[in-house]
C-alpha cells in the first residue's frame, strides 16, 4: 500500500545564466528508497542510487550537479530549460513515487523565486 507523499519545490522561476536547486522529499512511508531518478520531460538528467551513488547523464554533465541530498542543481540556465522536471523515487515495497516541479527561466534580471522549503 502506497502511503507516502512527495513534497517538491513546486513552481519556481530563475534568471537566465543563474542556477536553481530542484528538491523533492518523500515522507509518510516506511518504504526504503533504492534509487531516485531526475527527468526533464522524457529525458533522464541524473540518477542517485542508494548503493552506487550519483550518475549524471553525459549530455548534462556540464550543467547539472548532484545534491544537495537527493536534490539536483541546474547551472548556467537557459530559456530552453523552462519546463517540467520530475523526481521519481523507486521504493521497496511501495513502488514509484513521482514529484513534479515546473521551472520557468526568465530573461529578466528580476526573477521571482517560488517559495522554497528546507529538507529537515
Amino acid at each position: 500500500m502506497m502511503t507516502g507523499t512527495i513534497e517538491t519545490t513546486g513552481n519556481i522561476s530563475a534568471e537566465k545564466g543563474g542556477s536553481i536547486i530542484l528538491q523533492c522529499h518523500l515522507s509518510s512511508t516506511t518504504a526504503q528508497v533504492t534509487q531516485v531518478n531526475w527527468e526533464q520531460q522524457d529525458q533522464l538528467l541524473a540518477i542517485c542510487n542508494a548503493d552506487l551513488g550519483w550518475h549524471i547523464s553525459p549530455s548534462f554533465k556540464d550543467r547539472v550537479a548532484p545534491g544537495p541530498g537527493l536534490g539536483l542543481t541546474l547551472q548556467s540556465l537557459t530559456v530552453n530549460d523552462t519546463g517540467e522536471y520530475f523526481c521519481i523515487y523507486h521504493t521497496y515495497p511501495d513502488g514509484t513515487y513521482t514529484g513534479r516541479i515546473f521551472l520557468e527561466v526568465l530573461e529578466s534580471s528580476v526573477a521571482e523565486h517560488g517559495a522554497r522549503f528546507q529538507i529537515p
Epitope: A31, Q32, V33, D51, H90, T91, Y92, P93, G95, T96
Partner: antibody, heavy 122, light 106 residues
Framework: EIQLVQSGSELKKPGASVKVSCKAS????????MNWVRQAPGQGLEWMGW????????TYAQGFTGRFVFSLDTSVSTAYLQISSLKAEDTAVYYC???????????????WGQGTMVTVSS | AIRLTQSPSFLSASVGDRVTITCRAS??????LAWYQQKPGKAPKLLIY???TLQSGVPSRFSGSGSGTEFTLTISSLQPEDFATYYC????????FGGGTKVEIK
C-alpha cells in the same frame, strides 16, 4: 562475493524464545532491504515481512505480528529475527533474503541465506 | 493480498522435455514477477525477475513471459539438475509466493 550467512539450527521448547541472525557480506548492507521468509516442513515459501536497513523500521506480514521481531545491527551488517513464546507450529526453516535491483522493475530476492531450521518440541 | 496460483502443482517430465509452468495473479501486477528454483534442503535461487529477465548466471534454457495476471516459466530442454520445485513471486505490493510446482523425473 555477496552472501548472507545465517546462524545454526535451533531446538527449543514451547514457550521459549529464539533469535536467528543473518550476516551480510560483500555489499553495502544499508542499501538493500532485507526480508524474512518461512518454510514449514514440506510446505511452500511464506513471506514474513521486511526491515528497512537504512532506518531500521520493520514491517510484518499478516500473521507475523506480536511474537516476531525484526532488528538490525548495522555495525556488523547483521539482521535478526526473534520469535518469542514459541509454538510447535513455528517449526520451520527461516530464510533471510535481500531485495536486489535498484529500480522497481528489477526488484527480486537475489541473495538468500542458507536457512536456519528452528524446531519447537517438548 | 495478491494471491498467486501456480499450475500444475506436480509435473512429471523426462530429460530433454520442454516444460511450462503457469502462474496466475488474482489482480494485475504489471511485470513485477520473479521465478525461483528450490532444491531439497537448499535455499531458493532466483532465476528470472521482471517476468522475463534472466538473472546473471542462469542458463538460457530458462525463460519467462507474461504480464498483468498470467505468467509462464519455460524450460526449453529439461536437464537432470532442473528437477526441483519452482515458485513464482509477485513484487507489485507486499510480496507473496505461489504454492510451488514440483518437477519430478518421469
Amino acid at each position: 562475493e555477496i552472501q548472507l550467512v545465517q546462524s545454526g539450527s535451533e531446538l527449543k521448547k514451547p514457550g521459549a524464545s529464539v533469535k536467528v541472525s543473518c550476516k551480510a557480506s560483500g555489499y553495502t548492507f544499508t542499501s538493500y532491504p532485507m526480508n524474512w521468509v518461512r518454510q514449514a516442513p514440506g510446505q511452500g515459501l511464506e513471506w514474513m515481512g521486511w526491515i528497512n536497513t537504512n532506518t531500521g523500521n520493520p514491517t510484518y506480514a499478516q500473521g507475523f505480528t506480536g511474537r516476531f521481531v525484526f532488528s538490525l545491527d548495522t555495525s556488523v551488517s547483521t539482521a535478526y529475527l526473534q520469535i518469542s513464546s514459541l509454538k510447535a507450529e513455528d517449526t520451520a526453516v527461516y530464510y533471510c533474503a535481500r531485495v536486489g535491483g535498484y529500480s522497481v522493475d528489477e526488484y527480486a530476492f537475489d541473495v538468500w541465506g542458507q536457512g536456519t531450521m528452528v524446531t519447537v518440541s517438548s | 493480498a495478491i494471491r498467486l496460483t501456480q499450475s500444475p502443482s506436480f509435473l512429471s517430465a523426462s530429460v530433454g522435455d520442454r516444460v511450462t509452468i503457469t502462474c496466475r495473479a488474482s489482480q494485475g501486477i504489471s511485470s513485477y514477477l520473479a521465478w525461483y528454483q528450490q532444491k531439497p534442503g537448499k535455499a531458493p535461487k532466483l532465476l528470472i525477475y521482471a517476468a522475463s529477465t534472466l538473472q546473471s548466471g542462469v542458463p538460457s534454457r530458462f525463460s519467462g513471459s507474461g504480464s498483468g495476471t498470467e505468467f509462464t516459466l519455460t524450460i526449453s530442454s529439461l536437464q537432470p539438475e532442473d528437477f526441483a520445485t519452482y515458485y513464482c513471486q509477485q513484487l507489485n505490493s507486499y510480496p507473496t509466493f505461489g504454492g510451488g510446482t514440483k518437477v519430478e523425473i518421469k
